[in-house]
Interface confidence: low
């Protein structure tokens, strides 16, 4: 492309006429502000194409860029474009007018921008100011483009002096928009609702100032649209929230609700989904099994736990032997019901330092206006066994007897054993079990009694020994589910002068 005159910058007189010529090997065209002004196009005999742009009665408003380009640039090099800048100094024109859009400069990052205030005369001195300030800012000026630099979120004006008058440009507004990668979170006031109740969902995006929310939901598919509302979260910069509110939910509103957020500056997007269940009426359901017989150990603490699902939130009561329980002021009983997820609950009864009197029939009842469940069990207090007495006697019949008495809950088992070699028993020689054979040398008689008030069993067992010819260590061991206890006695023959 060949441009005459070649430029790249021309200063022309007001009211004059000027001719620009561009020629090339393919059709060429002059462009001004993205438009083609009236021009004369021709093709010479040698195959050269040309276009002549005649500028008549020039004014300051003719100041600006002029481009010559190929009329059909397909298949041609992209640099086949010539730029010419024309100044028409005109004292009647201050700053060249801007489109409204040029007055608002939006930034998404700290970057150099241009405030495009331009004058018609390249000799004029132009200064940049904050709109409210008189001090000129130290920013470089290009008469063809404007002031370029890094600017803060403020409004700016340009000033120049034409003759003896000071001229101000329009105000330019610089805005730094908050934009970041999008991270969406969606939550619901409740993910389970009864029909007739409201569904309310919130979609929140952080760190972006200009976003667009789009919801998809079951009702939308049937053409019944719900208008979401969008707002800033109070006291949180760039936390924007969209709320989708569906009053009086129907069973068909069950399903997946998706919030899609797009950020229009960089065209980022993210979406999150949440499931909503609409139920016909409320429910309470037990989860897991709780045995009908539960145990606690005397003087230890015991927590009894029931897990259930419910909606809406239920009232939970505990009973013992049909009497309502509450947290005791003495701290012996503690009741708590925790919401471990939206519809799942754990109710706990804690007995602190369990007492015998706390055995009995317990019931937990969970209920609301739509449903109820109850769960009952018997609590047994287990008491470790104690050997209360171990004594030896010599009845006149000549045989020797050993009596062992002990208590515990559940019922204790009794084990008798004996050892004849005192020096080696019980470390080296295992004791011999007694009373479980038909041998005549020992006989066993055991009685069991249940003491209602103490809620424990008493075991009394008598061992009859026929022939004791040397000292014998006799041991009584009581065992039950929560422990064992042992005592021993040395039984000596009648003929020996001592007893231990």
């Amino acid at each position: 492309l060949v441009v005459t005159p070649p430029g790249p910058e021309l200063v022309l007189n007001v009211s004059s006429t000027f001719v620009l010529t561009c020629s090339g090997s393919a059709p060429v065209v002059w462009e001004r502000m993205s438009q083609e002004p009236p021009q004369e196009m021709a093709k010479a005999q040698d195959g050269t194409f040309s276009s002549v742009l005649t500028l008549t009665n020039l004014t300051g408003l003719d100041t600006g860029e002029y481009f010559c380009t190929h009329n059909d640039s397909r298949g041609l090099e992209t640099d086949e474009r010539k730029r010419l800048y024309i100044f028409v100094p005109d004292p009647t024109v201050g700053f060249l007018p801007n489109d409204a859009e040029e007055l608002f400069i939006f930034l998404t990052e700290i970057t150099e921008i241009t405030i495009p205030c331009r004058v018609t005369d390249p000799q004029l001195v132009v200064t940049l100011h904050e709109k409210k300030g008189d001090v000129a800012l130290p920013v470089p000026y290009d008469h063809q483009r404007g002031f370029s630099g890094i600017f803060e979120d403020r409004s700016y004006i340009c000033k120049t002096t034409i003759g003896d008058r000071e001229v101000d440009s329009d105000a330019y507004y610089v805005y730094r928009l908050q934009v970041s990668s999008i991270n969406v979170s969606v939550n619901a006031v409740q993910t389970v609702v009864r029909q007739g109740e409201n569904i309310t969902l919130m979609c929140i995006v952080i760190g972006n100032e200009v976003v667009n929310f789009e919801w998809t939901y079951p009702r939308k598919e049937s053409g019944r649209l719900v208008e979401p509302v969008t707002d800033f979260l109070l006291d949180m910069p760039y936390h924007i929230r969209s709320i989708l509110h569906i009053p009086s939910a129907e069973l068909e509103d069950s399903g997946t609700y998706t919030c899609n957020v797009t950020e229009s500056v960089n065209d980022h997007q993210d979406e999150k989904a949440i499931n909503i269940t609409v139920v016909e009426s409320g429910y309470v359901r037990l989860l897991g099994e709780v045995g009908t017989l539960q145990f606690a150990e005397l003087h230890r603490s015991r927590t009894l736990q029931v897990v259930f699902e419910a909606y809406p939130p239920p009232t939970v009561l505990w009973f013992k032997d049909n009497r309502t329980l509450g947290d005791s002021s003495a701290g012996e009983i503690a009741l708590s019901t925790r919401n471990v997820s939206e519809t799942r609950y754990v109710s706990e009864l804690t007995l602190v330092r369990v007492k015998v009197a706390e055995a009995g029939h317990y019931t937990m009842r969970a209920f609301h206006e739509d449903a109820e469940v109850q769960l009952s069990f018997q609590l047994q207090i287990n008491v470790p066994v104690r050997v209360l007495e171990l004594s030896e006697s010599h009845p006149d019949s000549g045989e020797q007897t050993v009596r062992c008495r002990g208590r515990g809950m559940p019922q204790p088992n009794i084990i008798w054993s004996a050892c004849r070699d005192l020096k080696r028993c019980p470390r080296e020689l295992p004791p011999t079990l007694l009373g479980n054979s038909s041998e005549e040398e020992s006989q066993l008689e055991t009685n069991v009694t249940y003491w209602e008030e103490e809620q424990e069993f008493e075991v009394v067992s008598t061992l009859r020994l026929q022939h004791v010819d040397r000292p014998l260590s006799v041991r009584c061991t009581l065992r039950n589910a929560v422990g064992q206890d042992t005592q021993e006695v040395i039984v000596v023959p009648h003929s020996l002068p001592f007893k231990v």
Partner: nanobody, 125 residues
Framework: EVQLVESGGGLVQAGGSLRLSCAAS?????????MAWFRQAPGKERDFVAS????????YYTDSAQGRFTISRDSAKNTVYLEMNSLKPEDTAVYYC?????????????????WGQGTQVTVSS
């Protein structure tokens, strides 16, 4: 469809005050909306003046409005107000009320979705 109707314009002496109202209708609630006032002087572009978010009342003003004008809203009446004090002849313009369903646009000085017909304010010297 959202409708906006401005009122309260008129002739006032320089230094005087006016209160413009913008009654919004077409929705039960304007929660989530940004509302704004613009003005257009004869032969000039339409200029942004001030804006407010409906729910929380975030406000934003151009330099020329800051300190002299106050934007507010009454949710119960679905109305937005522009209180204008210390009026100057250069405030003479047609004042337009605008609304946008994206509250996040309250600082964006164009692209509002809904516009009123405008009310004339003339300030004489």
């Amino acid at each position: 469809e959202v409708q906006l109707v401005e009122s309260g314009g008129g002739l006032v002496q320089a230094g005087g005050s006016l209160r413009l109202s913008c009654a919004a209708s077409g929705r039960t609630s304007f929660s989530g909306y940004a509302m704004a006032w613009f003005r257009q002087a004869p032969g000039k572009e339409r200029d942004f003046v001030a804006s407010i978010t409906w729910s929380y009342g975030y406000t934003y003003y151009t330099d020329s409005a800051q300190g002299r004008f106050t934007i507010s809203r009454d949710s119960a009446k679905n109305t937005v107000y522009l209180e204008m004090n210390s009026l100057k002849p250069e405030d003479t313009a047609v004042y337009y009320c605008a609304a946008d369903p994206k509250a996040s646009r309250f600082r964006i000085l164009r692209e509002y979705a809904y516009w009123g017909q405008g009310t004339q304010v003339t300030v004489s010297s």
